[in-house]
């Protein structure tokens, strides 16, 4: 049995998969911040783990996935204000008892040390300093990304 | 480049709906949040509320109770009721682009609306 | 009554500058780096000036500069042009997710 939470974050992640392939991302759009291969947008406003992911996939990316403590540091540097949380794209599954990416893959739990408690209707916030779980309900800022796509030079058969 | 067009009634009666549609054209409806804002004649400017292209919306305190937004992303509209209008209600209207929920990058021309009988 | 406090006229002759001043509380303008500014020429739409305390949208002249100091924004515009004559709108986003303006300056190019 699925909470609510885990069917909104695998329902918008399997319409995102449906949508038709839009052309690769080459520059940031305006207001968002490139960070190496991908463009973050931090949300000024505030909003439930819920809203936020819907927030995300309307703005045609996804709540922030860290792939590692390197990208972790990189991102909070980002963040200039050092008392201001951020949801990112991760959760607590009841199902399997562990954090889940919303890309379905689970957290290593080297990469990031979480202050708070692992259980249901947790969710995942960062700060200029560290990383925390949170109630899904707490209505605090978020951050989306979509990524660049890798510019490769085409090459034309001769005409 | 981006405009908006604010459209609806110029006039309403007191204690009827007030519905405005804003038309959004050469650019995404769906990056965005939309508000509407409106300015008394010779006043200044009150925010009335933003939607997001999700749904969800925020609304001015003071005028939360009479307020209902919408979108319709497929036709690239937005659209504002206000109900219970009084003669306190006539204003220009203008609708924005909201990009962060914070500022207006892009406004309509703005449409008048008045409550009178 | 506006929620932010700005004075009702401003001038100055071309050339010169001219700060206009925006006045909150902790809750808006001291409480966020999310302070606009708007331009509104006679019955034109208003027009973004400024963006978080001191961002220029591109097309906006250098002339126009923002900053902040605790509960007050200001706006300066310097080397006056007989065009900057309007009505300037401080705004600011404030606790949960509201937005509030100012009442606004009338700006008199001498």
């Known amino acids: 049995q699925k909470s609510s939470i885990e069917k909104c974050s695998v329902d918008i992640q399997q319409s995102r998969n449906k949508t038709t392939e839009r052309p690769g991302l080459l520059n940031c759009p305006i207001y968002w911040q490139q960070l190496r291969e991908k463009c973050l947008l931090f949300s000024h406003t505030v909003n439930p783990w819920n809203n936020s992911l819907a927030d995300c996939s309307t703005k045609e990316s996804s709540l922030l996935l860290i792939r590692d403590k390197d990208e972790l540091i990189h991102t909070q540097n980002l963040i200039r204000d050092k008392a201001i949380l951020f949801w990112i794209g991760l959760n607590f599954s009841l199902s399997e008892k562990n954090w889940k990416w919303i890309n379905g893959s689970f957290l290593n739990s080297n990469d990031l040390e979480i202050r708070g408690d692992a259980k249901e209707n947790s969710c995942i916030s960062i700060s200029q300093t560290s990383v925390y779980s949170e109630y899904c309900s707490t209505e605090i800022r978020w951050i989306c990304q979509k990524e660049l796509t890798p510019v490769r030079n085409k090459v034309y058969p001769d005409s | 480049q981006v405009q908006l067009q604010e459209s609806g009634p110029g006039l309403v009666k007191p204690s009827e709906t007030l519905s405005l549609t804003c038309t959004v054209s050469?650019?995404?409806?769906?990056?965005?949040?939309w508000s509407w804002i409106r300015q008394p004649a010779g006043k200044g400017l009150e925010w009335i509320g933003r939607i997001y292209t999700s749904g969800s919306n925020n609304y001015n305190p003071s005028l939360k109770s009479r307020v209902t937004m919408s979108v319709d992303t497929s036709k690239k509209q937005f659209s504002l009721k206000l109900s219970s209008v009084t003669a306190a209600d006539t204003a220009v209207y203008y609708c924005a682009r909201d990009p962060l929920g914070t500022f207006f990058d892009y406004w309509g021309q703005g449409t008048l609306v008045t409550v009178s009988s | 009554q506006s929620a932010l406090t700005q004075p009702p006229s401003a001038s100055g002759s071309p050339g010169q500058s001219v700060t206009i001043s925006c006045t909150g509380t902790s809750s808006d303008v001291g409480g966020y780096n999310y302070v606009s500014w708007y331009q509104q020429h006679p019955g034109k739409a208003p027009k973004l000036m400024i963006y978080e305390v001191s961002k220029r949208p591109s097309g906006v002249p250098d002339r126009f500069s923002g900053s902040k100091s605790g509960n007050t924004a200001s706006l300066t515009v310097s080397g006056l042009q007989a065009e900057d004559e309007a009505d300037y709108y401080c705004?600011?986003?404030?606790?949960?997710?509201?937005?509030?303006f100012g009442g606004g300056t009338k700006l008199t190019v001498l």
């Open positions: 050469g650019g995404s409806i769906s990056n965005y949040y």
């Open positions: 705004s600011s986003y404030a606790d949960t997710n509201n937005v509030v």
